[in-house]
């Protein structure tokens, strides 16, 4: 969480951003809130990016003002216009690209003053893993698959029964480049699994951590998946 204060002029307002991550090819949110103002016509929101000449987005007098927008963001940005009056300046970024990563500034002007805060935006790819029993294998084997990751993650297996055990000797992980030549499919196989145990396949890079669990018993198989972004720090 980054909290910024206006430093010029008589009054300053608090602006708060939250560091976040964007999933390549999907839509992302750059989060920014500010002390609300009851005068919508006086509110100006400017999003800027370090190293980019034009603006990422500008909203003023109740509507988008995109004449100064940088080419790389053309047609890809929107604020939540109905939420501006209650202090939400968050930016929706469509079709996130790897090159969208960087430092952004959310700059706010209201009738009460000015303020800004920076936001670190990471980009990559992350997806939920699915763990299945591989019935084609000769021994009891689990197969963990996740369709899109970038940068290349690490994969670690764990077990509820054998806590702290190192499964690297009995597992094999491969990374297959997807058709767009950036993201990769992750496949990890765990051998010699025992029944009545819960196994976890943990995939992690510097952006996200995802876990796929599978519980195998005589009578049923239970699965659960969980994904967590690693860098949601507010400023």
């Amino acid at each position: 969480l980054i909290i910024g204060f206006g430093i010029s002029g008589r009054h300053s307002i608090t602006v708060t951003t939250v560091a976040s991550a964007g999933n390549i090819g999907e839509d992302g949110i750059l989060s920014c809130t500010f002390e609300p103002d009851i005068k919508l016509s006086d509110i100006v929101i400017q999003w800027l990016k370090e190293g980019v000449l034009g603006l990422v987005h500008e909203f003023k007098e109740g509507k988008d003002e995109l004449s100064e927008q940088d080419e790389m963001f053309r047609g890809r940005t929107a604020v939540f216009a109905d939420q501006v009056i209650v202090g939400n300046a968050s930016l929706r970024l469509k079709n996130v690209q790897l090159t969208d990563a960087g430092t952004y500034k959310c700059y706010i002007i209201t009738s009460k003053g000015k303020g800004n805060a920076n936001l670190e935006y990471k980009t990559g790819a992350f997806s939920m893993p699915e763990v299945n029993v591989d019935y084609n294998a000769s021994s009891e084997t689990l197969r963990c698959e996740a369709p899109r990751w970038f940068p290349q993650p690490t994969v670690v297996w764990a077990s509820q029964v054998d806590q702290g055990a190192n499964f690297s000797e009995v597992s094999n992980t491969s990374f297959e480049l997807n058709s767009e030549n950036v993201t990769m499919k992750v496949v990890s196989v765990l051998y010699n699994v025992t029944i009545n145990n819960t196994y976890s396949c943990m995939i992690e890079n510097d952006i996200a951590k995802a876990t796929g669990d599978i519980k195998v018993t005589e009578s049923e198989i239970k699965r659960r998946s969980h994904l967590q972004l690693l860098n949601s720090k507010a400023s």
Epitope: E35, I38, L40, S41, E61, D82, S111
Partner: antibody, heavy 117, light 107 residues
């Protein structure tokens, strides 16, 4: 659940003052503007003013400037509207209304103020 | 101040009718307009925000449209519980101002 609970009806003499309270629960009181709106019998809605409790910033409609005072007690999440030099035309239902998710999204139940000699 | 002119000031309609209420601003307010429904002895109820977005729990027979200076609230098929007074509100410029109201009565 968001709730705005206002104080009870008041009967006042011309020239007196009235203070109406509005207790808020269910959202962060200090971070959003609280407005006051009134409605005379059989009439439309009229905006009086607003307060930002976190900083005690206030804005008043020009018509009420100098006669109305908005305050807030952040320890009890309660907003107050005091109207002085009352006249018969001030007889109305007074509402507090929040601007939490949107402008005037939640309303108090209203407080009837009757000004009569 | 921005003046909001609502029309008609009252109308009579039957259950099942399509009802249209208009609100006109004296200057451009972009889409910064909400609609409220009020029944006798009750506070106004938040109905539509930012011209066309339905507030939580509001039936889909209500809809809003417009931008700039001209706005419309439409009830596609009037129900018994819809007989009430409707107000528009502009929050683009200070001070916020309401329309004069439209009373929807049973024919």
């Amino acid at each position: 659940e968001v709730q705005l609970v206002q104080s009870g009806a008041e009967v006042k003499k011309p020239g007196a003052s009235v203070k109406v309270s509005c207790k808020v629960s269910g959202y962060p009181f200090t971070s959003y503007w609280m407005h006051w709106v009134r409605q005379a019998p059989g009439q439309g809605l009229e905006w009086i003013g607003a307060i930002y409790p976190g900083k005690s910033d206030t804005e008043y409609a020009p018509k009420f400037q100098g006669r109305v005072t908005l305050t807030a007690d952040t320890s009890t999440s309660t907003a107050y509207m005091e109207l002085s030099s009352l006249r018969s035309e001030d007889t109305a239902v007074y509402y507090c209304t929040s601007t939490w998710t949107h402008y005037f999204d939640y309303w108090g139940q209203g407080t009837t103020v009757t000004v009569s000699s | 101040d921005i003046q909001m002119t609502q029309s008609p000031s009252s109308l009579s309609a039957s259950v099942g009718d399509r009802v249209t209420i208009t609100c006109q601003a004296t200057q451009d307010i972009v889409k910064s307009l909400n609609w409220y429904q009020q029944k006798p002895g009750k506070p106004p109820k938040f109905l539509i925000y930012y011209t066309a977005q339905l507030a939580e729990g509001v039936p889909s027979r209500f809809s809003g449209s417009g931008s700039g200076t001209d706005f419309t609230l439409t009830i596609s098929s009037l129900q018994p519980e819809d007989f009430a007074t409707y107000y528009c509100l502009q929050f683009y410029e200070f001070p916020p101002t309401f329309g004069g109201g439209t009373k929807v009565e049973i024919k």
